[in-house]
Interface confidence: low
Amino acid sequence: FRNDKCGDTIKIESPGYLTSPGYPHSYHPSEKCEWLIQAPDPYQRIMINFNPHFDLEDRDCKYDYVEVFDGENENGHFRGKFCGKIAPPPVVSSGPFLFIKFVSDYETHGAGFSIRYEIFKRGPECSQNYTTPSGVIKSPGFPEKYPNSLECTYIVFVPKMSEIILEFESFDLEPDSNPPGGMFCRYDRLEIWDGFPDVGPHIGRYCGQKTPGRIRSSSGILSMVFYTDSAIAKEGFSANYSVLQSSVSEDFK
């Protein structure tokens, strides 16, 4: 679904696109377009991604620009003002609304922009499956600071009757040391399961700088989900995994 109207209220039913009027051809002069994107469920969040073909008049974003607000209108939390030829990073809302405002002046136009919107579930750009007998799992950007508003799923699949050993070389997530802090890891956290996320036995929830230590999984599947909030990023984590054939599987060789 593509929408190039100058402004609209969009209730997300499936992923779709909104564009500056006329995209990818030159946008119109003297436009002021406002889009309100709404998730169908009040507990859902929204993710928008800008098409790399992004072209708005540069000049310090004084004349042509697109603004993103985390909320129902311009009173929402300001997430950025964008122009030029470099597409903005993805934006994930904190609640069920994103408000987008596009302004153009009376001269100098570019191709404009296209935004894909969808319900934010998992972070596809940072989620990964691992099927090799050993490997390295790193948080996005490691060892640089990880991005905000992530939900990354890492799943290691190995043959049944094998044991997965996961060892962390580095671990630094935003701590939660204020009461009830270390109990809940309310800000950034890494969840680990022996099996699929939310299904297999929960191994633990981790944040701060205390490494999770050596993790063993005997189900043939080890899952990690890395969540980050909208502020304060740290270095993240790097972990090595290896697969041990169990004595049971040796018996069947």
């Epitope: 204020n178 009461p179 802090g181 270390g182 109990m183 809940f184 929960h202 191994i203 633990g204």
Partner: antibody, heavy 115, light 107 residues
Framework: EVQLLESGGGLVKPGGSLRLSCAAS????????MSWVRQAPGKGLEWVSS???????YYAESVKGRFTISRDESKNTLYLQMNSLKTEDTAVYYC?????????WGQGTLVTVSS | DIQMTQSPSSLSASVGDRVTITCRAS??????LNWYQQKPGKAPKLLIY???SLQSGVPSRFSGSGSGTDFTLTISSLQPEDFATYYC?????????FGGGTKVEIK
Amino acid sequence: EVQLLESGGGLVKPGGSLRLSCAASGFTFSSYAMSWVRQAPGKGLEWVSSISRTGYTYYAESVKGRFTISRDESKNTLYLQMNSLKTEDTAVYYCARVGTAFDYWGQGTLVTVSS
Amino acid sequence: DIQMTQSPSSLSASVGDRVTITCRASQSISSYLNWYQQKPGKAPKLLIYAASSLQSGVPSRFSGSGSGTDFTLTISSLQPEDFATYYCQQSYSTPLTFGGGTKVEIK
């Protein structure tokens, strides 16, 4: 299967001491914060104390300075050392695992403080 | 300290009824709100965490909603095994506090 088993309750005189234990099994004990919650006879639930997996400790104002929470990772056991007990400390004491909330509870152990 | 106020303190209902229990926090707690069920002589059991997430193994007739200061636990169709006392609890800050409880009795 997650299991929490409290012990150490009993009858004690005001001013006395008791040490409660909670033996944990069925999960990676070192990965979870743990808590004590109590319930006076016929009353509601009252949070007593918590210890994070990294060692932060938290106490209700009513027990601060008298109770000490601790954990022994090698024994998969949570403890509550209760000193200077008062009659108002009489309650069933539950240990609870802290996941997204108090997601698993023990069956409780009764502490009676009476002269 | 954050005070949690539950209402009603007790209610009578019949099997099949839709039951709603409310919980109000004395200040905003975002969605750090949990619901527990307790039967006489037993330990509490987690039903709902983070205001609206159903704990694994809990029947789907239980649901939670709300954010900020006002929260609701709903039992869509009351079953005989649901007669119990229900508590809300905030996990926003220490001291962690519980509501006074709502006893659901058979009419």
